[in-house]
């Protein structure tokens, strides 16, 4: 049987994605991160 029409069961919340690079010292390279909604995820 085909499904009857209904909206998707979730809402899409738009959030800012912020890329950042942080210098952590002359010989330690840099940390590159991705912050989603205030949480660093990568």
């Amino acid at each position: 049987d085909a499904e009857f029409r209904h909206d998707s069961g979730y809402e899409v919340h738009h959030q800012k994605l912020v890329f950042f690079a942080e210098d952590v010292g002359s010989n330690k390279g840099a940390i590159i991160g991705l912050m989603v909604g205030g949480v660093v995820i990568a």
Partner: antibody, heavy 123, light 112 residues
Framework: QVTLKESGPGILKPSQTLSLTCTFS??????????VGWFRQPPGKGLEWLAH???????SYNPSLKSRLTISKDTSKNQVFLTITNMDPVDTATYYC???????????????WGQGTTVTVSS | DVVMTQSPLSLPVSLGDPASISCRSS???????????LEWYLQKPGQSPQLLIY???NRFSGVPDRFSGSGSGTDFTLKISRVEAEDLGVYYC?????????FGAGTKLELK
Amino acid sequence: QVTLKESGPGILKPSQTLSLTCTFSGFSLSTSGMGVGWFRQPPGKGLEWLAHIWWDDDKSYNPSLKSRLTISKDTSKNQVFLTITNMDPVDTATYYCARRQLGLRSIDAMDYWGQGTTVTVSS
Amino acid sequence: DVVMTQSPLSLPVSLGDPASISCRSSQSILHSNGNTYLEWYLQKPGQSPQLLIYKVSNRFSGVPDRFSGSGSGTDFTLKISRVEAEDLGVYYCFQGSLVPLTFGAGTKLELK
């Protein structure tokens, strides 16, 4: 407040085409997610879903009757129509229309029904 | 088609009694969006159906809290904690997940 009211011919002969109108108020079929469906109930029996039409003119039919059914709407007049071709005495029933609205913040159920219109098919 | 099987078909009660109606679907009515569109309607004598419960367990506006719905998958129940005179009529379960949309045969709640 939301109201729906069905109208039809009352009596018609076998092989004729039934034309039903659902006239409603308190909501608009131009509203995103809004829809109106048709149902019927033979005397002393249970309910059967027939068809549904959405604000964007998408339509859904009961496959067992699809070849005989046509649902349509006039958004500006707040009306939904159902035609059933080749009527037979077994199609004798009370015909109802009801509202159903899609949406995460909607009930998404038949929350308002019309009073029904009785249709008798007899030679 | 999804067959909705209600039991009992007749339910004699005394006012103030609890009542329970079972509804089983012939296959899962879990929609791909994660919702189960199982609804309960009451049709009082000479009237149109009226919505009581939607999405298994949600009471429609104005429905007394003595009505409750539960279940999942293929097994659903409507309970009335204490039957009142205005509750008498025929109760239909309904699935709105799969085409064709289908009703149960109805359960007649009547006085003993």
